[in-house]
C-alpha cells in the first residue's frame, strides 16, 4: 500500500480468482483513544471500533472511503484505491490502446517544434468518475524539470457503438535548448483514477522522435503564362522553430485528382517553391518534414488546382 | 561560443554537400545495424544514449546559430580550444568563433572515425561474420574531414590485446551509429547555417 | 472453490459451427479476463483468445480470426466460443482458463472436425 | 508458430535431477514473467511455477523456475516417477499481451 496523496492510498493487488488479497491496517488521524468506530462510504453499518482497523482487501467492494467516526462527528477518512496486476502486468482498463506507433500504445504525444513544448494524449470509452494526473521529467535517475496543466477533455467521438473520449495535456520542459542534442529522454507518466480503481501509464521518448510540424503556411499558385504549369509557393508555419537555415524543413508536393483512385504526382522539394502541372479539378497539397531527422510528416496544407 | 552571421558566400562552402553525405551514409549504416542485429538491444529505446565526444569536444555550444544566443539554456559552461586553420573557411571574414566550431566538428570525426576503425577490426575477427561497418560511411568521414582540413596530431588506433566479446561489441557498434547519427544530424544543421549565412 | 465446467464439443462437418459454454463458479465471474486454449491431438498448447472482464475488449490468434467469437454473459457466469467455418485443422480439446497468476482450468472439451 | 522454444525431451532416473529450458527473446520472456505448467496424460494443464520462480500451494518443493534474460528453466530435483508428463513454459509478448505465448512442450520420461 502506498499514498497517492493525501488521504488516499493504493492498494496493489495480485488479481486472480480466490486470490489472499492484501491485509491493511487504517489509522484514524486524532489523538482520540477511545470510542472510535468506522464505516465503509456511505454504510452505517459499523465495521469495526479502536484506533485502527485491520482489513482483508481482495476485490472492489473492499476498496472506497474508510471513516473514522466518535459521537457521531467524522475525525478522518482514507480513500482505499486498487491497482490490478493481472499475471505480472499492471492493469490498463482505463485507457484505449491506440496501438500507433505500435500495439500497447496508450499515450502519445507530439511536439511542433524543439523549443522543450510538447502535447500529449490519450483516449477512453469511460465518461463519468474519471480523474487524470500527469507528471513529467527528462530522465528518471536524475530528473530534470517538466511542467506539465492539467488534462483536459479535448474531443469526443462516436465510434460504432461507443462514444470515445480524447484527453490532452501541455507540458513545458523546464530549460530547453532547440540546438541540443538529447541523450535522455523526456518521461510521461499518467496517472488514471476510474471510480475505486488507480492505474498508471508511462511514455519515454525524445522530442527529436516526437517532431511533427504544422503545415506549411500561405500556400499559393501561380499560373506560368503559356503552360499548364503552375509555380506553388509556401512558407514555412509559424510555429517551427527558428533560425530556418539551421532548423531546416523539406517539403513533399501531391497533385491529386478528384478521385483517390486517380494516380498522385509528388514531388520532393528543400525549397518554398516548385512547379507542377495542374491538372482540371485536381488540388496540390504540400507537407513538411524536419530535413536532417525524419521524424513525422506534417499534415497536409492543401489548395485547388482551380 | 556562436556563429556571428558574417560568413562564407554560399557557393563558397564546400563542406555542406560532404555533411549531407554522412547523415546518408550514417543513417543507411544504422538501418542495417538495426536489421542485421534484430535481436540485439538495438533500437533507440533500448539502447543507452552515450556521447563519445562528451567533455572532448563542445561542437553544439562552438555552432551555436546567433539567434539561440540569447536562451541561457544553450549556453553550456562548457570551453574548448581548438586549432584554427581550415579550408573550408572559404573566407578572410571567418571568425574566430566559427573556425572553433569547425574544428570541433572535425575532432568529433577523428574520435568517431577512431572508434569505427577499431571497432571494424573487432568485427572482421568474427566468425559469425554478421556485420560490418560500411566502407562508405568511413570514406565519407574521411572526405568532410579533408575538406575541413585542420591540423591536428593523429590518434593512433586502439589496440585490444584481449579477446574481443563480439556481442558486447555489436552494442556498443548500435551505441556509437545512434549517438554519431544525431551528431551528423548537428554537423548537417550546422552547415546549412553556415551556407545560408 | 473456484470450478470451470465446460460443454458444448463433439463432432462437426468442414464449414459449419459449434458453440462452446464454459460455466463459472466459486469466484465473482465478472471481475476477471478469460481465454480459450486449444491442443490439437498430440500436439502442444495453443491460445484462442481472450475476452476481458467486462466484455470490452476482446482478442484473437491470427489462426480463428474472422471465423471465431469470444463473448461472456456476466449474469450467467458464463463464457462462450462461437466457432464458424470450421476447418479439420480446428480439431483440438479446448479449454477455458481464468487470467492471473494464478490460473483456473476447465475440464476441456474435445471438437472434432470432419467429414 | 511458437517462438518459445522447448527440448522435445528429456529423461531421467528417480532422484536425478532434470531441467528443462525454454528460450525466447526480448520482447516475450524479456519482458515478461514466465509460468510452467505440467500436463498429465488426458487432463487439463496444471501450474507449476508463476511470476518465473513462484510456486503455488500445494506443488512439492522440487519443482523450481528461474529466469535469465531471454530464456527459462524448470528444474526437478529428484525427479520422481509420477513426474513423468508433459512441460510448458508461458509468457505474454510485448506487442500482442494479454495473447498466452506458450513453449514448444517437453516430453519427461522418468527411465527404470
Known amino acids: 500500500i502506498w499514498e497517492l496523496k493525501k488521504d488516499v492510498y493504493v492498494v496493489e493487488l495480485d488479481w486472480y480468482p480466490d486470490a489472499p488479497g492484501e491485509m491493511v491496517v487504517l489509522t484514524c488521524d486524532t489523538p482520540e483513544e477511545d470510542g472510535i468506530t468506522w464505516t465503509l462510504d456511505q454504510s452505517s453499518e459499523v465495521l469495526g471500533s479502536g484506533k485502527t482497523l485491520t482489513i482483508q482487501v481482495k476485490e472492489f467492494g473492499d476498496a472506497g472511503q474508510y471513516t473514522c467516526h466518535k459521537g457521531g462527528e467524522v475525525l478522518s477518512h482514507s480513500l482505499l484505491l486498487l491497482h490490478k496486476k493481472e499475471d505480472g502486468i499492471w492493469s490498463t482498463d482505463i485507457l484505449k490502446d491506440q496501438k500507433e506507433p505500435k500495439n500497447k500504445t496508450f499515450l502519445r504525444c507530439e511536439a511542433k517544434n524543439y523549443s522543450g513544448r510538447f502535447t500529449c494524449w490519450w483516449l477512453t470509452t469511460i465518461s463519468t468518475d474519471l480523474t487524470f494526473s500527469v507528471k513529467s521529467s527528462r530522465g528518471s535517475s536524475d530528473p530534470q524539470g517538466v511542467t506539465c496543466g492539467a488534462a483536459t477533455l479535448s474531443a469526443e467521438r462516436v465510434r460504432g457503438d461507443n462514444k470515445e473520449y480524447e484527453y490532452s495535456v501541455e507540458c513545458q520542459e523546464d530549460s530547453a535548448c532547440p540546438a541540443a542534442e538529447e541523450s535522455l529522454p523526456i518521461e510521461v507518466m499518467v496517472d488514471a483514477v476510474h471510480k475505486l480503481k488507480y492505474e498508471n501509464y508511462t511514455s519515454s521518448f525524445f522530442i527529436r522522435d516526437i517532431i511533427k510540424p504544422d503545415p506549411p503556411k500561405n500556400l499559393q499558385l501561380k499560373p506560368l503564362k503559356n503552360s499548364r504549369q503552375v509555380e506553388v509557393s509556401w512558407e514555412y508555419p509559424d510555429t517551427w522553430s527558428t533560425p530556418h537555415s539551421y532548423f531546416s524543413l523539406t517539403f513533399c508536393v501531391q497533385v491529386q485528382g478528384k478521385s483517390k483512385r486517380e494516380k498522385k504526382d509528388r514531388v520532393f522539394t528543400d525549397k518554398t517553391s516548385a512547379t507542377v502541372i495542374c491538372r482540371k479539378n485536381a488540388s496540390i497539397s504540400v507537407r513538411a518534414q524536419d530535413r536532417y531527422y525524419s521524424s513525422s510528416w506534417s499534415e497536409w496544407a492543401s489548395v485547388p488546382c482551380s | 561560443r556562436n556563429l556571428p552571421v558574417a560568413t562564407p558566400d554560399p557557393g563558397m562552402f564546400p563542406c555542406l554537400h560532404h555533411s549531407q553525405n554522412l547523415l546518408r551514409a550514417v543513417s543507411n549504416m544504422l538501418q542495417k545495424a538495426r536489421q542485421t542485429l534484430e535481436f540485439y538491444p538495438c533500437t533507440s529505446e533500448e539502447i543507452d544514449h552515450e556521447d563519445i565526444t562528451k567533455d572532448k569536444t563542445s561542437t553544439v555550444e562552438a555552432c551555436l546559430p546567433l539567434e539561440l544566443t540569447k536562451n541561457e539554456s544553450c549556453l553550456n559552461s562548457r570551453e574548448t580550444s581548438f586549432i584554427t586553420n581550415g579550408s573550408c573557411l572559404a573566407s578572410r571574414k571567418t571568425s574566430f568563433m566559427m573556425a572553433l566550431c569547425l574544428s570541433s566538428i572535425y575532432e568529433d570525426l577523428k574520435m568517431y572515425q577512431v572508434e569505427f576503425k577499431t571497432m571494424n577490426a573487432k568485427l572482421l575477427m568474427d566468425p559469425k561474420r554478421q556485420i560490418f561497418l560500411d566502407q562508405n560511411m568511413l570514406a565519407v568521414i574521411d572526405e568532410l574531414m579533408q575538406a575541413l582540413n585542420f591540423n591536428s596530431e593523429t590518434v593512433p588506433q586502439k589496440s585490444s590485446l584481449e579477446e574481443p566479446d563480439f556481442y558486447k561489441t555489436k552494442i556498443k557498434l548500435c551505441i556509437l551509429l545512434h549517438a554519431f547519427r544525431i551528431r551528423a544530424v548537428t554537423i548537417d544543421r550546422v552547415m546549412s547555417y553556415l551556407n545560408a549565412s | 472453490q473456484v470450478q470451470l465446467v465446460q460443454s458444448g464439443g463433439g463432432v462437426v462437418q468442414p464449414g459449419r459451427s459449434l458453440r462452446l459454454s464454459c460455466a463459472a463458479s466459486?469466484?465473482?465471474?465478472?471481475?476477471?479476463?478469460m481465454h480459450w486454449v486449444r491442443q490439437a491431438p498430440g500436439k502442444g498448447l495453443e491460445w484462442v483468445a481472450f475476452?476481458?472482464?467486462?466484455?470490452?475488449?476482446?482478442y484473437y490468434a491470427d489462426s480463428v480470426k474472422g471465423r471465431f467469437t469470444i463473448s461472456r454473459d456476466n449474469s450467467k457466469n458464463t463464457l462462450y466460443l462461437q466457432m464458424k467455418s470450421l476447418r479439420a485443422e480446428d480439431t483440438a480439446v479446448y479449454y477455458c482458463?481464468?487470467?492471473?497468476?494464478?490460473?483456473?482450468w476447465g475440464q476441456g472439451t474435445m471438437v472434432t472436425v470432419s467429414s | 508458430s511458437y517462438v518459445l522454444t522447448q527440448p522435445p525431451s528429456v529423461s531421467g532416473t528417480p532422484g536425478q535431477r532434470v531441467t528443462i529450458s525454454c528460450s525466447g527473446g526480448?520482447?516475450?520472456?524479456?519482458?515478461?514473467?514466465v509460468k510452467w505448467y505440467q500436463q498429465l496424460p488426458g487432463t487439463a494443464p496444471k501450474l507449476l511455477i508463476y511470476?518465473?520462480?513462484q510456486r503455488p500451494s500445494g506443488v512439492p518443493d522440487r519443482f523450481s523456475g528461474s529466469k535469465s534474460g531471454t530464456s527459462a528453466s524448470l528444474a526437478i530435483t529428484g525427479v520422481q516417477a509420477e513426474d513423468e508428463a508433459d512441460y510448458y513454459c508461458?509468457?505474454?509478448?510485448?506487442?500482442?499481451?494479454?495473447?498466452?505465448?506458450f513453449g514448444t512442450g517437453t516430453k519427461v520420461t522418468v527411465l527404470g
Open positions: 482458463k481464468t487470467h492471473g497468476s494464478h490460473d483456473n
Open positions: 475476452i476481458r472482464y467486462d466484455g470490452s475488449n476482446k
Open positions: 466459486g469466484f465473482t465471474f465478472s471481475s476477471y479476463g
Open positions: 526480448r520482447s516475450n520472456i524479456g519482458s515478461n514473467t
Open positions: 508461458q509468457s505474454y509478448d510485448r506487442g500482442t499481451h494479454p495473447a498466452l505465448l
Open positions: 511470476d518465473n520462480d
